[in-house]
Each structure stands twice: as C-alpha cells, then as structure tokens.
Amino acid sequence: KSPIFGPEEVNSVEGNSVSITCYYPPTSVNRHTRKYWCRQGARGGCITLISSEGYVSSKYAGRANLTNFPENGTFVVNIAQLSQDDSGRYKCGLGINSRGLSFDVSLEVSQGPGLLNDTKVYTVDLGRTVTINCPFKTENAQKRKSLYKQIGLYPVLVIDSSGYVNPNYTGRIRLDIQGTGQLLFSVVINQLRLSDAGQYLCQAGDDSNSNKKNADLQVLKPEPELVYEDLRGSVTFHCALGPEVANVAKFLCRQSSGENCDVVVNTLGKRAPAFEGRILLNPQDKDGSFSVVITGLRKEDAGRYLCGAHSDGQLQEGSPIQAWQLFVNEESTIPRSPTVVKGVAGSSVAVLCPYNRKESKSIKYWCLWEGAQNGRCPLLVDSEGWVKAQYEGRLSLLEEPGNGTFTVILNQLTSRDAGFYWCLTNGDTLWRTTVEIKIIEGEPNLKVPGNVTAVLGETLKVPCHFPCKFSSYEKYWCKWNNTGCQALPSQDEGPSKAFVNCDENSRLVSLTLNLVTRADEGWYWCGVKQGHFYGETAAVYVAVEERKAAGSRDVSLAKADAAPDEKVLDSGFREIENKAIQDPRLFAEEKAVADTRDQADGSRASVDSGSSEEQGGSSRHHHHHH
C-alpha cells in the first residue's frame, strides 16, 4: 500500500481552478526527492505534466504550478483554466513515475455554468454583490415587478416594485427598473450571505401573461490562499474587496474558534497587543484595496486570517472577505537576531539587521514604527547617505559586518527612543525584521565631554574614557557624516582616572585635531568594536569659533558645555522614491503632522546640498528632538 495520500475524486467546472494536495511521510529523503503529477494513459503509462524539478508540460504552460511544503510532508498542484479535456485519471507521486510511491486521483471537469433550462446561474463570493437581470415584454412594462426565492416548495417574496422588502434582505437589496428603452429590471443584492444561495424567480406582471425568469444563485465561501513564510520574516496580506466597500471600515482578523475572528488590526484604530510594533495597515486605494504587513513572524502567528469590510471594523455576516492560511516555516533562512535591545539613557545601542545575502547591493533602511492610526514606519536612515534631520550626529547605518547583516548605531539615547524599529531593504520584502529598543536605568560606560568648542587654527584634544570591561575591544574615534563614521587617528594616553574600582586596564584615548578649520566642525564618536561588530559609542559635538587667545585646547570632562536643548524646525519632508521600496506608501512621511517634532525633517536635497556649517548647526540645535 502506497504511503502517498490525496483526494480520490476531484470535481470542478470549466474555467475554474483546482488545488490538489498530496501527502507523503515527511522523512528526510521524501522531503527532497522529486515530486510529480502525471496523467495516466490508456496503456498504463503515466505522462508527467509537472514536477518539482521545474518541468512543465506544454499542456500546462502558464496555468499550473507544483509547490512542495517539506515541513508538512505535502505538495500542492494548482491547475487553472480547466477544460473538459482535463478530465481523466492522474497520479501524484514521489521519485520516478513508474515506482509505487503514488496516489491515484480522478479529475472530472464538467461544463461551466450557463443557461440551464432557461435558468441563469450566478456564482458570487460571500459578502460580494450580485445583480440579477430580469427581462420583460412591453405589455408588462407598467406592471408590478417582483423577485421570489424558492424555499422548499413555496416561492417567498423577496422584493417588489411597490416597495416591499423581505426582512432577511433589509438594507442590502434594491430593485432597479431600467430606462424606458430597455425592457429589463434588475435586483441588486449586497453583502451576500451563504443563506442567500438558492433558486430565485423574477416576474413582471401577476397574471397569466406575466414574464418569468429563473435564476440560480450560488454563494461561494472564499477558499483560503496558502501562504508559507519564514519564522522571523514578514508576510503581506493584499486585500482587494472591490470598490463598493471603498468607504467601509476594513479589518484583518485571525480565526480562533467557531465563528470567532479576533481583530488583528482595523482602520478604526484597533490593534491586537500581540502585533504591537510589527504590523502596518497600508493606506487603502480608491478601489478599496489595502494590505497588511506583519514582520517578526512567530510560530504562534500561524493560522487562518480573514480580511474584510464592515462598518464595525470586524467580521459580521455579509462582510465581503478574503482568506489566507498562514504557515510559519521554522526551518527559517532568516537568522536569529535579538528582538529586544536595551540601552542606557545617554549611551547607545548597536542593532544588527539581517538581509538576504544574495542582495548585498540592495539599499538598506531603518525606520521607526509608529502606532498612531493604522501604523506607519517613517524612515530614519538609509545606506545611500540619507539621515532624518533630527537624527544627524547620532544615527548611522553601516554595511558592516556584511554577508547578510548590516549594523545600525543610535547614540545619545533618551527615553523617547524607546520603541519598535524595522530593518528592511529595497529587495526581498520577506526579510523585514523588527527590534524593540528599551531604555534602561544606568550610566554610560564611555565618558566624553559634552559639547566642545575648538578655535580656528589651534589644536584640540578630546578625551574618551573607556572602562576596563572594554580592555579587549578595539577603541576608535571617528567623524560622523550622513554616509557613516570615518575613522580618525587617536592616541592611547594610558589608564583613565575617570572610573572608581577600575584597574590599569581602563583607558583614556584622545582625538587630536591639529590646526582646526571650519571643516572640523561636526559630530565625533568614540566607540568600541570587535572586528566588524560594534559596541557602545559616545558622541561629542565640536563647534569651531574664531581665535580669541593663542594656544591649544585640551578639553577635560569638567569643562564640557551642555548641549543646548533648542527646537529648530527644518521645512520639507522626506518622500521615498518608488524605486526604493516596493510600496512607498508604507514608509513615506505624511505632510500633515500634528506634532512639530515630526516636521523637523529635512528633504534629501537639503541634506545633500547644505554646507557643513549648516548641517552641523542644525544638528547641534535639534539633535535631541525626534
């Protein structure tokens, strides 16, 4: 007896699609061996139509695919545009066609719906709209028009032209009589329910000369689309419910038990706590379609999801819906990375972001998830040299360590930096990942002066004190710019005296700027790293002023200026190019922003073209605001 199992009989109609699932024991060998779908010939052979190794017969070109789901021990054969010629006996199997590892499937394709005994067949999805057309003759033009539903042996009036509406259809049905030129009336039923299915009779007139027309309404449940995504990755549900619900509240829910469908997110502002920080409901198009992105997929996210439209923002009878069955693949290609990174106020975090290593040339992005309204994720930094204005001097995206990981460093942390951040690229959208930054109590490990003023033409020495815990780390100074942080020569001045209970392994490493020029103004970072992996950083703003008295400046921790806490707004806003991200609306800034902090966002033009003084000055004034 073959261990392969599937549907013995499949019945469908012309023009339709079938999706045939075949089950196999998920042993290591079976998972990776060839899967096939073949048609049995009269003389016993079985001719391959499609296989997992890429072969597709000309008979199936452009209308069939075979997908293997190794975790579950299943493979699925999808065949579209069925014709009666597709009727026959098939096998789904593993290995070689002639071997016994197969299962027999009978496919029967019957004639498509049409006029059967003068009955018009209407096949419509649950929640959608149907228009039943009813022709009549001139002599019945002025007479009563009506639609009946056959319930058992009896016709029950549904609607008529005198204004009657059956209570089961209240608020979702209308009868339209076309202009005088057309001898036709229509009945439009919205928000179709499964119970609406059945035989209908439309009638013009009430006597023996009345015109009658039969209609068969079939209401289909939406078949969940199978979606198979990697653990820690991302999924996008595209929901197209039709223009008739363009102005109705939209929702995505997850089925729990029975008819319960727990709202995951809706356009009325509801969001399930389990999805906080990792979900966005995309702005909807004029046609009512929208999409929902969920990142940082977890094992428990697997399940059946429905999207729909209803004024309540949740599933109700008659909601037009679309369905998905999400499977989360635990043999993920997306590497583990911390989902929570903790940083001390005043210090820094270094976040490692995974990306598809096949896409090393893709543009890398980092954005801050905002929960307001339906969620959005405005960009903060990218790998092409753009940094949101309020983050100048304290945020850097580095291509290191490379080979599938980039690094984002954020320093000068405040409690306002706590939140969810997304790592993404303009390549594979499945590789969007989420990290939560938490701000904790404590003291920064690196000690640097506050903001420093250098004198033109003089020498400036800026100290950075490293505690002994960093003795094995490489210590560096660099100058921040919007493409990264360029390393600078520094001097090890021996043990630091800035730490209590710290032995000779503590270090004072100084940055020396000789013959200071205007170009030296800006942000400088000292930090630690191990190879290409970055640790803590500390930032110092160096301002440059005219000479007052001769000599060099050696800045100590005590002499440091406090950074002024002023708000300076930049005009303009950041718009993401279409080429950069597949759906730019997910990340584009909105022009109307309630909080002035969000308006302090320079456009790319102002960042690229401004002089170093302008950039430095503006950074200096509002680096605390974001």
Epitope: I20, Y23, P224, L226, G258, E259, L315, Q325
Partner: nanobody, 127 residues
C-alpha cells in the same frame, strides 16, 4: 459555539445500505472541509472519508477500507455532510463521528488534524 450533530445510525444486516448525515450550523465562514471518522470498541479512531470545497471544485477523500463502497457528499454553504454506505460488513460496526475544519497542513487521516467533532452515532452491522 460550534456543534456538529450526526444522525442516521442504526442496526442493519450485512450487505445492507445506510445513510449518515451531519449538520454543523455554527461552523466558521471560511470552513470548507468536513469528514467522517469511526471508532470500534478497543480500537483507535479511523479515517473513513472527507470532502473539501474550493470555489466550484469539490475534493473527496476515502480511507482504504471503504473505497468503492462509501460515498461522501455535502453542501458547503449549508455546512451539511452525508455518508452513503453500501455493502456494509460486520467490521464496519463502530461509532461514526462527523468532523470539521481540519488544519490545512495536517494529514486528514489523522484525527488530531481536525478542530471540531460531533458526539457520534452508532452503526451496528450484524451478520
């Protein structure tokens, strides 16, 4: 609350026929799979047959021991399920359970893959 209610069980002679029915009024909108299992005294629950709907397509699955003798049918919109049993044998004696809404990725033949169950109806085939 989802309730699956079986009917049609009884006592018949070998080679007779019997038709079982199942109604599942509370099933979720998107449920599109229903099936039959049976359990004889002292034995594990065994897969009998299942039916799935997708759009205008219908998929029928059968257990090895009933192929060619039993026919599964149903109405997706009404959440009803029938099992026409012909050529009954004494070894078909069991409690027959209606099941609904399996895990999309589970093997339909395993009872653990199904979410909802009826209370069962007894079928006894005497020789």
């Amino acid at each position: 609350e989802v309730q699956l209610v079986e009917s049609g069980g009884g006592v018949v002679q070998a080679e007779d026929s019997l038709r079982l029915s199942c109604a599942a009024p509370g099933l979720p909108f998107s449920s599109s799979r229903m099936g039959w299992f049976r359990q004889a005294p002292g034995k594990e629950r065994e897969f009998v047959a299942a039916i799935g709907w997708s759009g205008r397509s219908t998929y029928r699955y059968y257990g090895d021991s009933v192929k060619g003798r039993f026919t599964v049918s149903g109405d997706n919109a009404k959440n009803t399920l029938d099992l026409q049993m012909k050529g009954l044998k004494p070894e078909d004696t069991a409690v027959y359970y209606c099941a609904a809404d399996p895990d999309y990725y589970g093997d339909y033949r395993t009872s653990g893959a199904w979410r909802y169950w009826g209370q069962g109806t007894q079928v006894t085939v005497s020789s």
